[in-house]
């Protein structure tokens, strides 16, 4: 799998997608887990609906939320109220038993708000009581990464 | 006018098998998720399962108790919905509703159900 | 699993009397919260979907509120054709029912 980044704003909500086979994965719950370290495991973060067939329901775990158009074949993460401690490697699976397939390598990198002046009556974060639905959500800018290019970089 | 009707109860000995069928009139039956509860007697509601529309060909999901021994199918050009019973223990008896999932606006279903059959008694006895 | 914890198991009002129903779920269900009307020998009939929202038909006096794990159903003022059995249900989980609450005139 190559990584896709999708670049976000700090305090604001980032969308990530993840493509898959409809077929392929039918009547399959997803997970959107973070990965910890090159090879550690990937930390569940939340899953789709217990039943299959309400994918389609938002469920949260925080500020993620994560839902699942089983037909059209996509699987939507979003990222709410973007932080710093955000940033980093993650993964779409779809889920078989006690085994999970990866759907999408995922990077997330979080970029400092440009209208950021430290002045926080300028700057706009959604409040606890503000719905996913209320949350504005700014367009992600992904790519893959280009062969050579190291998912997780050698730490010194 | 929007009509379900169950039939196909009556008394049945532990560890035997009955069907149920709901039989749906005045909707587009394959559109909708059709669903199956039961509330035995002086007790309150329990899902028992769904299924979902003719867009999810089929597809089931059922509460842990019925797992592995009630089956839900549908049958569209009849527009019925089936609930097959195996293995039956006496705690299966009540009084069982089909129900019509609501739809929402924008094509999925919701999971709130907006039209009941009137229910048909299963009593489970030896 | 969610547990559905609805108060009071019954209740008795007069006619033109506010009445409400509360439901509790064990952990955070959102808004994935439906309520029904039982009356006496006949099937369940929708009320409220979505925690606040009115079904299609469904007079004006029934009324429900809350979100994440306390949840309010409420009949503004009371008529005799609201002497039923109360249902509240999640679909954050799986799709559970509250214990009920019977409603009687007085």
């Known amino acids: 799998h190559n990584t896709t980044v999708f670049q976000g704003v700090e305090g604001q909500s980032l969308q990530v997608s993840c493509p898959y086979d409809s077929m392929k994965h039918w009547g399959r719950r997803k997970a959107w887990c973070r990965q910890l370290g090159e090879k550690g495991p990937c930390q569940r973060v939340v899953s789709t609906h217990n039943l299959w067939l309400l994918s389609f329901l938002r469920r949260r775990n925080g500020s993620t939320a994560i839902t699942d158009d089983t037909l059209g074949g996509t699987l939507t993460i979003t990222l709410r109220n973007l932080q710093p401690h955000d940033a980093g490697f993650y993964q779409c699976q779809s889920l078989h038993g006690s085994e999970a397939d990866t759907l999408r390598k995922v990077l997330v990198e979080v970029l400092a708000d440009p209208l950021d002046h430290r002045d926080a009556g300028d700057l706009w974060v959604p409040g606890e009581s503000e719905s996913f639905e209320d949350a504005h959500v700014e367009h992600s800018i992904s790519r893959s990464l280009l062969e050579g290019e190291i998912p997780f970089p050698p730490t010194s | 006018e929007v009509q379900l009707v169950e039939s196909g109860g009556g008394l049945v000995q532990p560890g035997r098998s009955l069907r149920l069928s709901c039989t749906a009139s005045?909707?587009?039956?394959?559109?909708?998720?059709m669903s199956w509860f039961r509330q035995a007697p002086g007790k309150g509601l329990e899902w028992v399962g769904f299924?979902?529309?003719?867009?999810?060909?089929?597809?089931?999901e059922y509460t842990a108790s019925v797992k592995g021994r009630f089956t839900i199918s549908r049958d569209g050009s009849k527009s019925i919905a089936y609930l097959q019973m195996n293995s039956l223990k006496t705690e299966d008896t009540a009084v069982y509703y089909c129900?019509?999932?609501?739809?929402?606006?924008?094509?999925?279903?919701?999971?709130?159900?907006?039209?009941w059959g009137q229910g048909t008694m299963v009593t489970v006895s030896s | 699993d969610i547990q559905m914890t609805q108060s009071p198991s019954s209740l008795s009002a007069s006619v033109g009397d506010r009445v409400t129903i509360t439901c509790q779920a064990s952990?955070?269900?959102?808004?994935?919260l439906n309520w029904y009307q039982q009356k006496p020998g006949k099937a369940p009939k929708l009320l409220i979907y979505?925690?606040?929202n009115l079904e299609t038909g469904v007079p004006s006096r029934f009324s429900g509120s809350g979100s994440g794990t306390d949840f309010t159903f409420t009949i503004s003022s009371l008529q005799p054709e609201d002497i039923a059995t109360y249902y509240c249900?999640?679909?954050?989980?799986?799709?559970?029912f509250g214990g009920g609450t019977k409603v009687e005139i007085k």
């Open positions: 129900a019509r999932g609501k739809r929402r606006d924008y094509g999925y279903w919701h999971p709130a159900f907006d039209v």
């Open positions: 005045g909707f587009t039956f394959g559109d909708y998720a």
């Open positions: 979505d925690a606040s």
């Open positions: 249900q999640e679909y954050d989980q799986y799709l559970t």
């Open positions: 952990q955070d269900i959102t808004n994935y």
């Open positions: 299924i979902g529309s003719k867009a999810y060909g089929g597809t089931t």
